[in-house]
């Protein structure tokens, strides 16, 4: 049994990264494998992450962590039985992968404005708090044309629209993402998405 | 809004015993380490103990065998233990979250040895 | 154990100048595991800096951290009356544990 493609790990910057790799073969992760974890610290204790299944020879491991400071580095073992297949290490603040938006909603009520609002996926004391900025992807349920992306670079997760920058009487979606300069993250998944029916009154043509 | 509410200090005898109690809020913490740091009057700082997630601890060698930390995730609370109190333990406790460095800090508490 | 040696003890000067604070390693430190903190009378110290030049949140940008290995600085740019206070550098080691410096009081002149 051998390691095909090395485990890659990407952390949200929280409690939980996220580690995959293949092997060189099919692989019952969870019977055959253990990935032992342990961050570099003197009050630190080893873990053990049970792998599942990623795809008939991939793997994939959610450890479970301390909050994230900068600083951290974690030992990885990967073992099959008695046998050390793979060593290695991670340093989670050089692999971030933000967690994704939540409670996205659209408010139509803002005469003729859009005002769409999120949550922020980080409680106050997250280091990433205060450094996300946002990508809106809006788009037509009737017109895969119809797509369009707005970058929220404040802090603030919300973004304002006039309802006339899109089309009247049809249904959009909206669905927000992500990521962080400051550790130059991926960008997080999109968060569900939402629907709803634009309509809003024409102006008056003046003749 | 991280905080961290210590209790617990008084005046002890020489040989006495005493617990520190730190009650925090505003984040997760069972994922954090928490420590001890005491200051003696007029004197600087000095790391007293810590303790990790999974329960891993470490002293100073000046209370080792004296004092036990400890943690109860369910009440965030970290306490400390402090047995055969002598003279120069009188200080003021700082509870503090951290790991390399310490991010938030109790108010304090004044421990009194005297006779 | 690593022993930090802060110099100098007491720093006298004027609100609008600039302090230069020195902390000095019996060993070689990670720049990683350095910190430094502010303490006002009767109060709990305040994280200024760590990982030897990062500003923890909330600090203002006047306050700044260099060095590496055995000689690691605070500097203050421009002295406000809230800045006179007592200032300690701390580190880290896998080993040992956690250590500060003897402090260094930053007083009005």
């Known amino acids: 049994m051998k390691v095909l493609q090395e485990p890659t790990c990407v952390s949200d910057y929280m409690s939980i990264s996220t580690c995959e790799w293949k092997m060189n073969g099919p692989t019952n992760c969870s019977t055959e494998l253990r990935l032992l974890y342990q961050l570099v610290f003197l009050l630190s204790e080893a873990h053990t992450c049970i792998p599942e299944n990623n795809g008939g020879a991939g793997c994939v491991c959610h450890l479970l962590m301390d909050d994230v400071v900068s600083a951290d580095n974690y030992t990885l073992d990967l073992w099959a039985g008695q046998q050390l297949l793979w060593k290695g290490s991670f340093k989670p603040s050089e692999h971030v992968k933000p967690r994704a938006p939540g409670n996205l909603t659209v408010h139509t009520n803002v005469s003729d404005t859009l005002l769409l609002t999120w949550s922020n996926p980080y409680p106050p004391d997250n280091y990433l708090y205060n450094h996300l900025t946002y990508a809106v992807n809006i788009w037509s349920e009737n017109d895969p044309a119809d797509f369009r992306i707005y970058n929220v670079t404040y802090l603030e997760p919300s973004l304002r629209i006039a309802a006339s920058t899109l089309k009247s009487g049809i249904s959009y979606r909206a669905r927000v993402r992500a990521w962080a300069q400051c550790y130059n993250t991926t960008w997080s998944e999109w968060s569900p998405s939402t629907k709803w029916h634009n309509s809003y009154r024409e102006p008056f043509e003046q003749h | 809004e991280v905080q961290l509410v210590q209790s617990g200090g008084g005046l002890v005898h020489p040989g006495g015993s005493l617990r520190l109690s730190c009650a925090g809020s505003?984040?997760?913490?069972?994922?954090?380490?928490m420590f001890w740091v005491r200051q003696a009057p007029g004197k600087g700082l000095e790391w007293v103990s810590g303790?990790?997630?999974?329960?891993?601890?470490n002293y100073a060698d000046s209370v080792k065998g004296r004092f036990t930390i400890s943690r109860d995730n369910a009440k965030n609370s970290l306490y400390l233990q402090m047995n055969s109190l002598r003279a120069e333990d009188m200080a003021v406790y700082y509870c503090?979250?951290?790991?390399?460095?310490?991010?938030?800090w109790g108010q304090g508490t004044l421990v009194t040895v005297s006779s | 154990e690593i022993v930090l040696t802060q110099s100098p003890g007491t720093l006298s000067l004027s609100p609008g100048e600039r302090a230069t604070l020195s902390c000095r390693a019996s060993q070689s430190v990670s720049n990683s595991y350095l910190a430094w903190y502010q303490q006002k009378p009767g109060q709990a110290p305040r994280l200024l800096i760590f990982?030897?030049?990062s500003r923890a949140p909330g600090i203002p940008d006047r306050f700044s951290g260099s060095g590496s290995g055995t000689d690691f600085t605070l500097t203050i740019s421009r002295l406000e009356p809230e800045d006179f206070a007592v200032y300690y550098c701390?580190?880290?080691?896998?080993?040992?544990?956690?250590?500060f410096g003897q402090g260094t009081k930053v007083e009005i002149k």
């Open positions: 701390q580190q880290y080691d896998h080993s040992a544990g956690w250590t």
């Open positions: 303790i990790g997630t999974g329960g891993a601890t």
């Open positions: 505003g984040f997760t913490f069972s994922r954090n380490a």
């Open positions: 990982g030897a030049s």
């Open positions: 503090a979250r951290g790991r390399y460095y310490f991010d938030y």
